[in-house]
Interface confidence: low
């Protein structure tokens, strides 16, 4: 029942065009040129895609034609390597196209930036967009691909064409609509939300595989599979597994034709096949493909069998544990995670592994041991502990938001975690602890059966942000250690790091808390970021300071805002007062 | 619920022609997966032909190769199978089917589920 096993194709080209249509072709082709190369204009990307195209068109029409046969990274490689301003834009990125496949393609992944000097996206006028909608749809559609792109390079391709579709329905409807802000302002903020978000959590999947492997990548699917498919079987869960691997294994190596093509096949297998895998399959399996996709990943947990058994009886009171673990050791945690998990929708991902992992290790050592099951027969024992650390994590934290609130409670997880791990660029600090800080507002209103996967596998997304940020730019020792030594430890690893002792207290600078006028035209998220980045640069400068310290300078801050904001002459008001707060905070924190 | 409508089935000697239509109906046809099958007396239906509506290429089996041609137009929904150099062992009953998934995978699937389907047009070629 394998979905993906397939006849040789004498033309990959010609197959995945035909398998696509030319429409999804030329999306995905310029989505992975964006992500490959992310300072190109996006002129230059729709003539390399354009080129393509009519290349792969050759080669439908006659598969023996001249280069159909070569495999799509030599193809999409070489066109590459024809742009002109390689070594000036992009410096040693342009050493890749000395190398051969399948070196070059890795060299151009490893070049990959996850934080690329471009230009924030400033959104238009909506009169200015629907323009621009209406004067040349696809090329409108083309730039949204291209602008997400080359600024998420790992962003799940597939699924950048299911955004894509919901932002050309968004313009088409609200184009046409009266009070046209009203319609399009809200949609696109929640593209923008739910990009980032999908973004994110894509990128985990990708460090998942390429820093831990293929291994690490499916005991994660295994374990949310199970949860989300309870009643499915182990042997349908491991392919499932098996499938869902291969296609994230793709898009993440730039492989997104086949990743498309492969997904598409998954999302159809899973739909002929729902009586055996779930009953809440039905509404996704009526949709669009790029609906259906998107709906199947996001689907609600089936309900538990009833009646399951304990899991005492296969894992710890059965004398065959030790022969059925040696026959087979990952078959056999597989189905330990696969049963724990099916049975614990109330536990993250990241808990089951942990659980799973400390059960690992309990077996290799006991089934050394001289009795082996006296040895393992407490190891459901060891499991407290570790599920009872996120509990009281979470507890705590949601009741602190509660208090306080997004805003605040992000501020206190900006002071904590500067506190740690101080060496890493405000920026960063700000962006990650204002990520960490939306856990509470999107999890804390769970009942407590769905709190914890919301929030710990939603914190593990969040710190692989912090992971990925902090390898371009290596600053802290701890935050390595955190981000390399364990994928699932990871929370646990930076809830545990206490006051960074060894950090040097930064230089003031009074430049660092200058205000102008332009503050009081921003919109109220971005007001908070200044503010956000100045409580950073405080806590840098003075890392022993008190919450009641810092809260006092902050509630400075923010009157002194307000304040000049109302005044007639603003630019002289936030120079003068700007000057006096300075002066007023360096004395509270005794600077 | 998708509906499809076939028509254009007949009665031809052997090295005529029949063009075959089948239109779509209740769902958005733009990125569906269209099929011809065909059942002889006895035997199991075998895909004919598919193309991807999104795009312009179609697959077609070995048997028909250079003889059938797919084609669709997406204004009317509808798309036609032109049979052409026609043989006694064309015959059968054509149905046609659709499947709203991404792109046509004959390599892949060939057999594959499609989850919707006309109440067939018959052809008859004699010789």
């Known amino acids: 029942r394998g979905v993906f096993r397939r006849d040789a194709h004498k033309s990959e080209v010609a197959h995945r065009f035909k398998d696509l249509g030319e429409e999804n072709f030329k999306a995905l082709v310029l989505i992975a040129f964006a992500q490959y190369l992310q300072q190109c204009p996006f002129e230059d990307h729709v003539k390399l895609v354009n080129e393509v195209t009519e290349f792969a068109k050759t080669c439908v029409a006659d598969e023996s034609a001249e280069n159909c046969d070569k495999s799509l990274h030599t193809l999409f490689g070489d066109k590459l390597c024809t742009v002109a301003t390689l070594r000036e834009t992009y410096g040693e990125m342009a050493d890749c196209c000395a190398k051969q496949e399948p070196e070059r393609n890795e060299c151009f992944l490893q070049h990959k930036d996850d934080n690329p000097n471009l230009p924030r996206l400033v959104r238009p006028e909506v009169d200015v967009m629907c323009t621009a909608f209406h004067d040349n749809e696809e090329t409108f559609l083309k730039k949204y691909l291209y602008e997400i792109a080359r600024r998420h390079p790992y962003f799940y391709a597939p699924e950048l064409l299911f955004f894509a579709k919901r932002y050309k329905a968004a313009f088409t409807e609200c184009c046409q609509a009266a009070d046209k802000a009203a319609c399009l302002l809200p949609k696109l903020d929640e593209l923008r939300d739910e990009g980032k978000a999908s973004s994110a959590k894509q990128r985990l999947k990708c460090a998942s595989l390429q820093k831990f492997g293929e291994r690490a990548f499916k005991a994660w699917a295994v374990a949310r599979l199970s949860q989300r498919f309870p009643k499915a079987e182990f042997a349908e869960v491991s392919k499932l597994v098996t499938d869902l691997t291969k296609v994230h294994t793709e898009c993440c190596h730039g492989d997104l034709l086949e990743c498309a093509d492969d997904r598409a096949d998954l999302a159809k297998y899973i739909c002929e096949n729902q009586d055996s895998i779930s009953s809440k399959l039905k509404e996704c399996c009526e949709k669009p493909l790029l609906e259906k996709s998107h709906c199947i990943a996001e689907v609600e947990n089936d309900e538990m069998p009833a009646d399951l058994p304990s899991l005492a009886a296969d894992f710890v009171e059965s004398k065959d544990v030790c022969k059925n673990y040696a026959e087979a050791k990952d078959v056999f945690l597989g189905m330990f995670l696969y049963e724990y998990a099916r049975r614990h929708p109330d536990y993250s991902v990241v808990l089951l592994l942990r659980l799973a992992k400390t059960y690992e290790t309990t077996l290799e050592k006991c089934c050394a041991a001289a009795d082996p099951h006296e040895c393992y027969a407490k190891v459901f024992d060891e499991f407290k502990p570790l599920v009872e650390e996120p509990q009281n994590l979470i507890k705590q934290n949601c009741e602190l938001f509660e208090q306080l609130g997004e805003y605040k409670f992000q501020n206190a997880l900006l002071v904590r975690y500067t506190k740690k791990v101080p060496q890493v660029s405000t920026p960063t600090l700000v962006e990650v602890s204002r990520n960490l800080g939306k856990v509470g507002s999107k999890c804390c209103k769970h009942p407590e059966a769905k709190r914890m996967p919301c929030a710990e596998d939603y914190l593990s997304v969040v710190l692989n942000q912090l992971c990925v940020l902090h390898e371009k730019t290596p600053v802290s020792d701890r935050v390595t250690k955190c981000c390399t030594e364990s994928l699932v430890n990871r929370r646990p690893c930076f809830s545990a790091l206490e006051v960074d002792e060894t950090y040097v207290p930064k230089e003031f600078n009074a430049e660092t808390f200058t205000f102008h006028a332009d503050i009081c035209t921003l919109s109220e998220k971005e007001r908070q970021i200044k503010k956000q980045t100045a409580l950073v640069e405080l806590v840098k400068h003075k890392p022993k300071a008190t919450k009641e310290q810092l809260k006092a300078v902050m509630d400075d801050f923010a009157a002194f805002v307000e304040k000049c904001c109302k005044a007639d002459d603003k630019e002289t008001c936030f120079a003068e007062e700007g000057k006096k707060l300075v002066a007023a905070s360096q004395a509270a924190l005794g600077l | 619920q998708v509906q499809l409508q076939e028509s254009g089935g007949g009665s031809v000697q052997a090295g005529g022609s029949l063009r075959l239509a089948c239109a779509a109906s209740g769902y958005t046809y733009s990125s569906a997966c269209m099929a011809w099958f065909r059942q002889a007396p006895g035997k199991e239906r075998e895909k004919v032909a598919t193309?991807?509506?999104?795009?312009?290429?179609?697959y077609y089996a070995d048997s028909v190769k250079g003889r059938f041609t797919m084609s669709h137009d997406n204004a009317k929904n509808t798309v036609y199978l032109q049979m052409n150099s026609l043989k006694p062992e064309d015959t059968g009953m054509y149905y046609c089917?659709?499947?709203?998934?991404?792109?046509?995978?004959?390599?892949?699937?060939?057999?594959?589920?499609?989850?919707?389907w006309g109440q067939g047009t018959q052809v008859t070629v004699s010789s």
């Open positions: 193309i991807y509506t999104g795009g312009t290429y179609p």
């Open positions: 089917a659709a499947d709203a998934s991404w792109g046509c995978r004959l390599s892949g699937s060939w057999g594959a589920k499609y989850n919707n």
